[in-house]
């Protein structure tokens, strides 16, 4: 049994880091493998992660961490029984993938303005709470070409757009994702999408 593709890990910079790797053949990850992880600091405690299958030869492990700070560095040991298959390290702050925003809501009752709001996925005491910026994706269910991205570079988790920038009388969907420049993170996954029917009063034509 050998590791074909070494583990790569990303952290949500809160409580979970996810590591993925591939074996050289079909593997029952949960029964055959264990991923041990431990902070490098003196007398830090070792933890065991039981991996799950992620395709025939792929494995994924969700490392639970009570919290994460920029100084943290973990040693990682991948074991198959008594055999050490791979040894590496992982610094969560250098491999951050933020959590996806939640509770995306479209408020359509504000005159001819659409107000989109969502929730910051981090608690206020987390470093990323005040460092997230967002991208909002709005698209038409009827017209695949009607697809747009709005970059939200301010901290408030909301976006206002004129309803008239979208077509009236058709359904739209929206979703939002986040990233943090401070840790040069990757983008989060998209939030679940929300749907609304766009309708607004056309202004009277001037004659």
């Amino acid at each position: 049994m050998k590791v074909l593709q070494e583990p790569t890990c990303v952290s949500d910079y809160m409580s979970i880091s996810t590591c993925e790797w591939k074996m050289n053949g079909p593997t029952n990850c949960s029964t055959e493998l264990r991923l041990l992880y431990q902070l490098v600091f003196l007398l830090s405690e070792a933890h065991t992660c039981i991996p799950e299958n992620n395709g025939g030869a792929g494995c994924v492990c969700h490392l639970l961490m009570d919290d994460v700070v920029s100084a943290d560095n973990y040693t990682l040991d991948l074991w198959a029984g008594q055999q050490l298959l791979w040894k590496g390290s992982f610094k969560p702050s250098e491999h951050v993938k933020p959590r996806a925003p939640g509770n995306l809501t479209v408020h359509t009752n504000v005159s001819d303005t659409l107000l989109l709001t969502w929730s910051n996925p981090y608690p206020p005491d987390n470093y990323l709470y005040n460092h997230l910026t967002y991208a909002v994706n709005i698209w038409s269910e009827n017209d695949p070409a009607d697809f747009r991205i709005y970059n939200v570079t301010y901290l408030e988790p909301s976006l206002r757009i004129a309803a008239s920038t979208l077509k009236s009388g058709i359904s739209y969907r929206a979703r939002v994702r986040a990233w943090a420049q401070c840790y040069n993170t990757t983008w989060s996954e998209w939030s679940p999408s929300t749907k609304w029917h766009n309708s607004y009063r056309e202004p009277f034509e001037q004659h």
Epitope: L39, V40, L42
Partner: antibody
Framework: EVQLVESGGGLVRPKGSLKLSCAAS????????MNWVRQAPGKGLEWIVW??????????YYADSVKDRFTISRDDSESMLYLQMNNLKTEDTAMYYC?????????WGQGTSVTVSS | DIVLTQSPASLAVSLGQRATISCRAS??????????MHWYQQKPGQPPKLLIY???NLQSGVPARFSGSGSGTDFTLNIHPVEEEDAATYYC?????????FGGGTKLEIK
């Protein structure tokens, strides 16, 4: 919210025994190393004992000043830390703190007072 | 055992000024890119509170006027600007090896 609440302190005669308890809540107790640190009246801080988690077979380390007299133990199912103190001496008079360790001693209980006097 | 020597034993600093506390270790407490030195604040009748871990990292919830620096054997805790509520005793502590020892403490008085 992390909380550590010590109990069991009191007045005891020299050569007597006492058992201190620490109730932990607000965190995954079973994954942390835990300490007892004491502070004699008007003095500085003295680390006395450390216990690691199950993943390290509950390894223990004692300061020379308490070795062979004090015993640390833990009950992960109840999130409890204990310190059994035997053959107490007057110099053991102190406030005893239960302390969590991660990168440093990051959370401390309010302490329980032990007085050894005849 | 590693002996930690704090200086001064006490100091008085005017409100808004800088307080500097030193901690010297009898041997290096740095290894593998980390300095295993931590700083605590203790007010009368209260348990110690972690301020700085691993020499320079601010513990969550601690005001940014506290900062730590140093490596090897020499470490410093700075408080600037000092506020009334900073009156306390400050301890350094290492976790480089067993036993983890504490400095003797520095009592800070606000003038």
């Amino acid at each position: 919210e992390v909380q550590l609440v010590e109990s069991g302190g009191g007045l005891v005669r020299p050569k007597g025994s006492l058992k201190l308890s620490c109730a932990a809540s607000g965190f995954s107790f079973n994954t942390y190393a835990m300490n007892w640190v004491r502070q004699a009246p008007g003095k500085g801080l003295e680390w006395i004992v450390w216990i690691r988690s199950k993943s390290h077979n509950y390894a223990t380390y004692y300061a020379d000043s308490v070795k062979d007299r004090f015993t640390i133990s833990r009950d992960d199912s109840e999130s409890m830390l204990y310190l059994q103190m035997n053959n107490l001496k007057t110099e053991d008079t102190a406030m005893y703190y239960c302390v969590r360790h991660l990168r440093a001693m990051d959370y401390w209980g309010q302490g329980t007072s032990v007085t050894v006097s005849s | 055992d590693i002996v930690l020597t704090q200086s001064p034993a006490s100091l008085a600093v005017s409100l808004g000024q800088r307080a500097t506390i030193s901690c010297r270790a009898s041997k290096s407490v740095s290894a593998s890119g980390y300095s295993y030195m931590h700083w605590y604040q203790q007010k009368p009748g209260q348990p110690p509170k972690l301020l700085i871990y691993l020499a320079s990292n601010l513990q969550s919830g601690v005001p940014a006027r506290f900062s730590g620096s140093g490596s090897g054997t020499d470490f410093t805790l700075n408080i600037h600007p000092v506020e009334e509520e900073d009156a306390a005793t400050y301890y350094c502590q290492h976790s480089r090896e067993l036993p983890p020892t504490f400095g003797g403490g520095t009592k800070l008085e606000i003038k």
